[in-house]
Each structure stands twice: as structure tokens, then as C-alpha cells.
Interface confidence: low
């Protein structure tokens, strides 16, 4: 498994992980304590056939072309957590780790 | 977690679970003992703002809209695997379970 | 509160267009589908289509496809249906209503609000 | 395309009544079916989802039923203020399909 790594000012068109920082003070987002910022990243791009594909089961959808299958897209494929401080709705603060906040690989599924 | 099913008559328009048997005797692909045709599914539609996306991170990165970021798409969020009996590169008939062959849910990511 | 408010009357002559505006308040205009039904006079409800604000995809009914766009501004939260080559029996009120989803059934929605309408007169 | 048949396409009643109005389709919509009231000069209100449930607001003297083809709209006790256009809609395939309407008059 491996998957594209760009920045902003890459060529690169076809699916690729981008650099992107979460901001939650800048989204007014006052009840995360920390961290008030993190790199979150994303994934943007074109999937071509056969690149990147995560499983074979994308080739099969592809092959047989069903009505309204749009082909595959460019989509996390491995994702990271990260720990968090923040109110819950009790207004108690909590410590966590939080699943899938960070966007590791990007793939075309 | 849960994903919407739909058939090709249904007038959904969102991110929903379609039945779909891949045949592989149409594929072509003789070197598949067994099974010749298998219920496959696949995912297709819009996927709306916070409509079943299974991370955070995918409603974060729609916050923070980054230059080329195309929006959550639909696609498989849950998988299981197949027992398949073929032939591998050397000829050899091989018994294994293959992952990821048939898509369980779909989601927004 | 949710409201959905339609442009004024339009007078076309035919093999003209018409462009209608719906402009929504009070919710998240991309969160929700579009739909645009119209009525000739004395005569039943017809649906024409409808859009989905949050990526422009439309859906258009088979016997309008040739001759009507369905778009969306999303920084007016405007939804706008324009019909082509106008006819005499294109005369009718057009209504913009939204599709309000309740369920986890694909078809699990009603169309909960609905425009004020706008009336199209083509006539020569 | 699925086709809506409603019945009758105009009825009198006096207030005080109860009326039911029918609406059959062409195939099986799986009780995804909608009635709307419509008032001359104005927008259509829904009343009706899903065959059998009651949208906000509406009074519980509006009723519905029906599965598979066929499909009713009861109003138990007219008043004066349900004199209107009653249609069914299918939203079970596309096209949308809307019934030909129910016109009810007072008598």
C-alpha cells in the first residue's frame, strides 16, 4: 500500500494527500480546549483506472459498469487519531482519543 | 453506523448500497474456479452535507474547504471477503478468502 | 422560520425562455433537495425535476430534458429553473418545494415546503 | 412511468361528513405516497407521507391508508376550511407522478 504525497503547488492531478491544518478557534468551534489547531489533510485528485486502487473489489465495479457507478474516488485509506480536550454536552471536560482525524494515505475506492 | 440500500427502481439520489453480481465468466476471467458469478453490490450518489459520513475529519476538511477539495463521495465503508478457489500465476489451484469482494455499507468519506 | 419565496409573473412570447428564482431562508439551502412541480391552469400537478443545491446534480423529469436547467446559487441560497423554447401550453404557475428527508429509507421524504409560485404566461 | 389514478375527480359533501378520496397505481409503490389540499390562488400543502403518516401541524381528522396499488385519503368530519383540491403524489420511482385530483365541493 503506498499513496501520493502533494502540496499546493504539485502537478500532480491524479489522487494525492494534500497538507491541511484544522483550525477549531477559526471555525468558532470554542468547546475543543485543545489543540486549537492540528493537521488534519485531506485527499484530492483524479483515479484513473487502476491507480491507486485499494481493493480488487473497485476493478470488478469498474468492469462491470453498472448504471450510476460513478468510477472510484479519491478518498482516505488510512486514517490516524488524535487526542483531544474538550467540553461534551454535560459541559464536562473530556480527555480522548478521537478515530479518523488525521488522513494518513489517500486511495482511489 | 448505517448505510441506505436502494435498487435500480428507487428514486434516492443519496449515497446508498446498489445490488450488483459480478459475473466472471463474462469478464472473461477463466482462471476463477469457483464462484463464476458472486453478489458484489456497489456504492453510488451524492453524498449531502453530513449525510452518513463516517468520519469527523470529512465534515473538518468541509469547514475548512481547501483549494481542490471535491467533497465527501460515496463509497464503501464496510467490506467482507470471499472464499474463492483459483488458479494462481504458476498454474497452482489456490483455496483462499479474498478480502474486500463484497461491500456491506456504503458511506461518505 | 423555513420559507421558500418565488419571483414575480413573467409574460414570454413563445420559442422564448424564462428563468424563475426560489430563494430560501431559514435553513441550510444546500442540505436539502430542490423540486420543481408546475400547473397549467385548472389542470393537475406535473414534476418537472429537481436539484441538489450542495453539488448542482439535477435530476429532470424525461419530458422536460431537452428544454429545462435546473441551477443553484449557493451564496444567495437561490435556486433558479429556466425553460426553454416557450409554448402556449407552458402557461402555468411553477412551484419550487423542498424535499425533507425523515427516514433511512431511500425513498423516505415529502415535500414539506413549498414556494408561493410563480406564474408563466406564453402567449403571442 | 407509474400512473395515478385518483377517484373520484369531484365530489359534494356537506359539513359535517366524512369523505374518502382513492388514488391506484399502475404498479406497486411500496406506500411511498403522498396527499397534498390545495386552495385556489395558493401552493400545495402536504398532508399525507409514506401512505399513513401525518405531517406536522396537519389535524388527526386527516387520515390515510393503503398498500401495493391502492391508496386512500379520509377526512372523518369535513369542516368549511377543507373545501379544496386533494392529489396524491407516487414517490416511489422517477418521474414524480401526481393524481389528476380530487375536487371537493360543498353540497
Known amino acids: 500500500d503506498f499513496g501520493l504525497d502533494c502540496d499546493e503547488h504539485s502537478t500532480e492531478s491524479r489522487c494525492c494527500r494534500y497538507p491541511l491544518t484544522v483550525d477549531f478557534e477559526a471555525f468558532g468551534w470554542d468547546w475543543i480546549i485543545a489543540p486549537k489547531r492540528y493537521k488534519a489533510n485531506y485527499c484530492s485528485g483524479e483515479c484513473e483506472f487502476v491507480f491507486l486502487q485499494k481493493y480488487p473489489h473497485t476493478h470488478l465495479v469498474h468492469q462491470a459498469n453498472p448504471r450510476g457507478s460513478a468510477g472510484p474516488c479519491c478518498t482516505p485509506t488510512k486514517m490516524s487519531p488524535i487526542n483531544m480536550l474538550y467540553f461534551n454536552g454535560k459541559e464536562q471536560i473530556i480527555y480522548g482519543k478521537i478515530p479518523a482525524m488525521v488522513v494518513d494515505r489517500c486511495g482511489c475506492s | 453506523d448505517f448505510g441506505l440500500d436502494c435498487d435500480e427502481h428507487s428514486t434516492e439520489s443519496r449515497c446508498c448500497r446498489y445490488p450488483l453480481t459480478v459475473d466472471f465468466e463474462a469478464f472473461g476471467w477463466d482462471w476463477i474456479i469457483a464462484p463464476k458469478r458472486y453478489k458484489a453490490n456497489y456504492c453510488s450518489g451524492e453524498c449531502e452535507f453530513v449525510f452518513l459520513q463516517k468520519y469527523p475529519h470529512t465534515h473538518l476538511v468541509h469547514q475548512a474547504n481547501p483549494r481542490g477539495s471535491a467533497g465527501p463521495c460515496c463509497t464503501p465503508t464496510k467490506m467482507s471477503p470471499i472464499n474463492m478457489l483459483y488458479f494462481n500465476g504458476k498454474e497452482q489451484i489456490i483455496y483462499g478468502k479474498i478480502p474486500a469482494m463484497v461491500v456491506d455499507r456504503c458511506g461518505c468519506s | 422560520q423555513v420559507q421558500l419565496v418565488q419571483s414575480g409573473a413573467e409574460v414570454k412570447k413563445p420559442g422564448a425562455s424564462v428563468k424563475v428564482s426560489c430563494k430560501a431562508s431559514?435553513?441550510?439551502?444546500?442540505?436539502?433537495?430542490m423540486h420543481w412541480v408546475r400547473q397549467a391552469p385548472g389542470q393537475g400537478l406535473e414534476w418537472m425535476g429537481n436539484?441538489?443545491?450542495?453539488?448542482?446534480?439535477?435530476n429532470y423529469n424525461q419530458r422536460f430534458k431537452a428544454r429545462v436547467t435546473m441551477t443553484t446559487d449557493t451564496s444567495t441560497s437561490t435556486a433558479y429553473m429556466e425553460l426553454r423554447s416557450l409554448r402556449s401550453d407552458d402557461t402555468a404557475v411553477y412551484y419550487c418545494?423542498?424535499?425533507?428527508?425523515?427516514?433511512?429509507?431511500?425513498?423516505?421524504?415529502?415535500?414539506?415546503?413549498w414556494g408561493q409560485g410563480t406564474l408563466v404566461t406564453v402567449s403571442s | 412511468d407509474i400512473q395515478m389514478t385518483q377517484s373520484p375527480s369531484s365530489l359534494s359533501a356537506s359539513v359535517g361528513d366524512r369523505v374518502t378520496i382513492t388514488c391506484k397505481a399502475s404498479?406497486?409503490?411500496?406506500?411511498?405516497l403522498s396527499w397534498f389540499q390545495q386552495k385556489p390562488g395558493k401552493a400545495p400543502k402536504s398532508l399525507i407521507y409514506r401512505a399513513n403518516r401525518l405531517v406536522d401541524g396537519v389535524p388527526s381528522k386527516f387520515s390515510g391508508s393503503g398498500s401495493g396499488t391502492d391508496y386512500t385519503l379520509t377526512i372523518s368530519s369535513l369542516q368549511p376550511e377543507d373545501f379544496a383540491t386533494y392529489y396524491c403524489?407516487?414517490?416511489?420511482?422517477?418521474?414524480?407522478?401526481f393524481g389528476q385530483g380530487t375536487k371537493l365541493e360543498i353540497k
Open positions: 404498479q406497486d409503490i411500496n406506500s411511498y
Open positions: 431559514g435553513y441550510s439551502f444546500t442540505g436539502y433537495f
Open positions: 418545494a423542498r424535499r425533507y428527508y425523515y427516514g433511512t429509507k431511500p425513498a423516505d421524504w415529502y415535500f414539506d415546503v
Open positions: 403524489l407516487q414517490s416511489d420511482e422517477f418521474p414524480l407522478t
Open positions: 436539484i441538489y443545491p450542495y453539488n448542482g446534480v439535477s
